[in-house]
C-alpha cells in the first residue's frame, strides 16, 4: 500500500523555539516515522532537517538550527515505514516574520504602596530579536486580587513603578511584549501576584517640581513632617529601556544630599543635555520613608519652559492679561520655539476659591469679577506637545484691585 | 564564567594599613557594583561598603567611614580595599562581592584573612 | 542603620525536617531581602533575592516569602549538604545590613 504524505503542516516559532506540527494523514498505517528537509533561497539541493529525522510523533523541533531568520526558508515532509510516500512541500516563509515574541520574565517587588516591575525578554541573548533588544515595550494588565477589576498599561519599558496602591493588598499583573516596528505584540506571561507592605511610618515625598533660577536648577517638593533629611537621586531615562538589565546606578546630587529643607538648589551644569528621573527620600534619623514618585525631567525643555510674564489691565468686571516671553537673567526674552497653552489661576484676595482658564492666546480676558476688589493672578505655561509633556513652574502671583463700576468700555 | 580572585592572607601591625584587591573576570566590572564584607572569626558578616567602578562613587557603613576606602582600576577588572589604623578587632575575612542584578550580591571572592598582631 | 534579627540563632535538626528561620528588620524594607548560605571556611552563596525569588540553581526545597518587616526562609526537607550557617540581608537602604545568622547543626 503506497504511504500518503503528511498534511497541514504547522511552523510555529516563538522567539527562538521552532516547532513543527502535523497531521498524519493516514491513521491506521502503524509504526510511521517522518522525516523534514529544508531549502534556502537560492540553493538547489534539500538538506535534512537535524531534529527532525525519523520522528515517531507529529511534532518537532528544529531550534538547534542555525538559520538566518531574515532568509525565505521551504521545508518538505515526507512519511516513511517500508517504503516512502512523496514529499509534501510546505510554502516558503521567512523566520522572523512568522516568530511570535514569547512571554516575558516578570520579577516583582513591592513597597506599601507601590509596585516595581522589571521585565525581561523569555528568551535570554534571543537570536531572533538580537537586532530588537532595544525596541521592546511593554504592556501590562494589572487588578486588585479581590476585585479582578483591571487596568491597562501600555508602552511601558524594562522597568516600570506603579503608584498610589493600597497597603497589604494583593495585586496581580500579567505583561506582554511589543515590537512596534514589526507589528509584533507577543504573548502574555503567566500571572505574577505580590502583597504590598504595610503602610510606612513616613510617607515619600511628593509633587516634585524643576525650575529654572538663574544658572540653577531648583528643586522643590511636598512633605508631611517637620524636622527631616533629604536626598535626591538621578538616573539616566534611556536606563529603562536596558533589556536584561536590572541593576539601576541611581546617582546622588551633591547639593541635595541630607538637605534640611524640602528644596535643594544644583547648578545646571550638573546635568548635560539629556533626559533624566529624578526622585526624592525623607528621612528622620531612625526611619526612612520609601522613594518618592520618579519625575521625568528634561533638560531641553526645562532649561526654557520658564514661568511666564504677564501684564494685567484692570477693568471694573474683567482682567485683561497680556502674555510676555519669559526673561531670563540679564532679563533677554526666552525664545519659545514650541506651541504652549497657558494656564491662569484667579482668586479673590480675600478668598481661597481659585478659578482656572485654560487659552492659547496670549491675550486673555478674565471675566465676571468685582468692583473695586482685588484679585490675584498667577500663569503657567505646559507645552502642548503630547509627548514632551511639560509644565512650568507658577509665576509669582500678581494683585490687582479692580475698577469702580461703568469702566468696562 | 565570573570569578573574582582576592589576594592573599596579609599580618599587620597594629596601626599599620594594608591594600586589599580583588580581581572580576567573565564580566565588565563597570557594570556592576563591587562590595567588600567583612567577617571576623566566628562572628557574622558586616557590610564594608561598595563602588560603582563606572566613576569612582563610593557608599560606607558609617563604622567604616574614614578607615576604609575603596577603590577601582577598571583596565585591570581589580577593585581594592584599603584599611588604615589597623587594631585587633580588623582581623577577618575580607570577601568581595559583585553587586549585580536587583543590586544582589551575586559572586563572592573566595576571601582574603586579614590578621592584625604585634 | 535598619537592624534585622534572626530567629532562632542556633538549631539543631535532622535530616528530613522542615526549618523555618526567620528575619525582622526594624523598619520597613519592602521585598528588598536576600537569603545567604555559608559553610565553614567558604564564601557565602545567594539562595533567594528579593524576598521570594530562588536562585537559578538553588534546590527547589529552598523558599523565601515576607515583606515590609517580617521575612522567612523555609526548607522544606533538610538535607545533609543543607547543613550551614543562614544569614538574611537588606538592601533596601545603605548601608546594607545583616541579620546576625542562624546556624543549623546535626542533632
Known amino acids: 500500500k503506497n504511504l500518503k504524505s503528511p498534511q497541514k503542516v504547522e511552523v510555529d516559532i516563538i522567539d527562538d523555539n521552532f516547532i513543527l506540527r502535523w497531521n498524519r494523514s493516514d491513521e491506521s498505517v502503524g509504526n510511521v516515522t517522518f522525516s523534514f528537509d529544508y531549502q534556502k533561497t537560492g540553493m538547489d539541493n534539500w538538506i535534512k532537517l537535524s531534529g527532525c529525522q525519523n520522528i515517531t510523533s507529529t511534532k518537532c523541533n528544529f531550534s538547534s538550527l542555525k538559520l538566518n531568520v531574515y532568509e525565505e526558508i521551504k521545508l518538505r515532509i515526507r512519511a516513511e515505514k517500508e517504503n516512502t510516500s512523496s514529499w509534501y512541500e510546505v510554502d516558503s516563509f521567512t523566520p522572523f516574520r512568522k516568530a511570535q515574541i514569547g512571554p516575558p520574565e516578570v520579577h516583582l517587588e513591592a513597597e506599601d504602596k507601590a509596585i516595581v516591575i522589571h521585565i525581561s525578554p523569555g528568551t535570554k541573548d534571543s537570536v531572533m530579536w538580537a537586532l530588537d533588544g532595544l525596541s521592546f515595550t511593554y504592556s501590562l494588565v494589572i487588578w486588585k486580587n479581590s476585585s479582578g477589576v483591571e487596568e491597562r498599561i501600555e508602552n511601558i519599558y524594562s522597568r516600570h513603578k506603579i503608584y498610589k496602591l493600597s497597603p497589604e493588598t494583593t495585586y496581580c499583573l500579567k505583561v506582554k511584549a511589543a515590537l512596534l516596528t514589526s507589528w509584533k505584540i507577543g504573548v502574555y506571561s503567566p500571572v505574577h501576584c505580590i502583597k504590598t507592605t504595610v503602610e510606612n511610618e513616613l510617607p515619600p515625598p511628593e509633587n516634585i517640581e524643576v525650575s529654572v533660577q538663574n544658572q540653577n536648577y531648583v528643586l522643590k517638593w511636598d512633605y508631611t513632617y517637620a524636622n527631616m533629611t533629604f536626598q535626591v537621586q538621578w538616573l539616566h531615562a534611556f536606563l529603562k529601556r536596558n533589556p536584561g538589565n536590572h541593576l539601576y546606578k541611581w546617582k546622588q546630587i551633591p547639593d541635595c544630599e541630607n538637605v534640611k529643607t524640602t528644596q535643594c538648589v544644583f547648578p545646571q551644569n550638573v546635568f548635560q543635555k539629556g533626559i533624566y528621573l529624578l526622585r526624592v527620600q525623607a528621612s528622620d534619623g531612625n526611619n526612612t520613608s520609601f522613594w518618592s514618585e520618579e519625575i521625568k525631567f528634561d533638560t531641553e525643555i526645562q532649561a526654557f519652559l520658564l514661568p511666564p510674564v504677564f501684564n494685567i489691565r484692570s477693568l471694573s468686571d474683567s482682567f485683561h492679561i497680556y502674555i510676555g516671553a519669559p526673561k531670563q537673567s540679564g532679563n533677554t526674552p526666552v525664545i519659545q520655539d514650541y506651541p504652549l497653552i497657558y494656564e491662569i489661576i484667579f482668586w479673590e484676595n480675600t478668598s481661597n476659591a481659585e478659578r482656572k482658564i485654560i487659552e492659547k492666546k496670549t491675550d486673555v480676558t478674565v471675566p465676571n469679577l468685582k468692583p473695586l476688589t482685588v484679585y490675584c493672578v498667577k500663569a503657567r505655561a505646559h507645552t502642548m506637545d503630547e509627548k514632551l509633556n511639560k509644565s512650568s513652574v507658577f509665576s509669582d502671583a500678581v494683585c490687582e484691585k479692580t475698577k469702580p463700576g461703568n469702566t468696562s468700555k | 564564567q565570573v570569578q573574582l580572585v582576592q589576594s592573599g592572607a596579609e599580618v599587620v601591625k597594629p596601626g599599620a594599613s594594608v591594600k586589599l584587591s580583588c580581581k572580576g573576570s567573565g564580566f565588565n566590572i563597570k557594570d556592576y557594583y563591587m562590595h567588600w564584607v567583612k567577617q571576623a572569626p566566628g562572628q557574622g558578616l558586616e557590610w564594608i561598603g561598595r563602588i560603582d567602578p563606572e566613576d569612582a562613587e563610593t557608599k560606607y557603613a558609617p563604622k567604616f567611614q574614614g578607615r576604609a576606602t575603596i577603590t577601582a582600576d577598571t583596565s585591570t577588572s581589580t577593585a581594592y580595599l584599603e584599611l588604615s589604623s589597623l587594631r585587633s578587632e580588623d582581623t577577618a575575612v575580607y570577601y568581595c562581592?559583585?553587586?549585580?542584578?536587583?543590586?544582589?550580591?551575586?559572586?563572592w571572592g573566595q576571601g582574603t584573612l586579614v590578621t592584625v598582631s604585634s | 542603620d535598619i537592624q534585622l534579627t534572626q530567629s532562632p540563632s542556633f538549631l539543631s535538626t535532622s535530616v528530613g525536617d522542615r526549618v523555618t528561620i526567620t528575619c525582622k528588620a526594624s523598619?520597613?524594607?519592602?521585598?528588598?531581602v536576600v537569603w545567604y548560605q555559608q559553610k565553614p571556611g567558604k564564601s557565602p552563596k545567594v539562595l533567594i533575592y528579593?524576598?521570594?525569588y530562588r536562585v537559578s540553581g538553588v534546590p527547589s526545597r529552598f523558599s523565601g516569602s515576607g515583606s515590609g518587616t517580617e521575612f522567612t526562609l523555609i526548607i522544606s526537607s533538610l538535607q545533609p549538604e543543607d547543613f550551614a550557617t543562614y544569614y538574611c540581608?537588606?538592601?533596601?537602604?545603605?548601608?546594607?545590613?545583616f541579620g546576625q545568622g542562624t546556624k543549623l547543626e546535626i542533632k
Open positions: 562581592a559583585r553587586g549585580g542584578n536587583f543590586y544582589v550580591m551575586d559572586y
Open positions: 540581608q537588606q538592601k533596601n537602604n545603605y548601608p546594607y545590613t
Open positions: 528579593s524576598a521570594s
Open positions: 523598619q520597613n524594607v519592602g521585598t528588598n
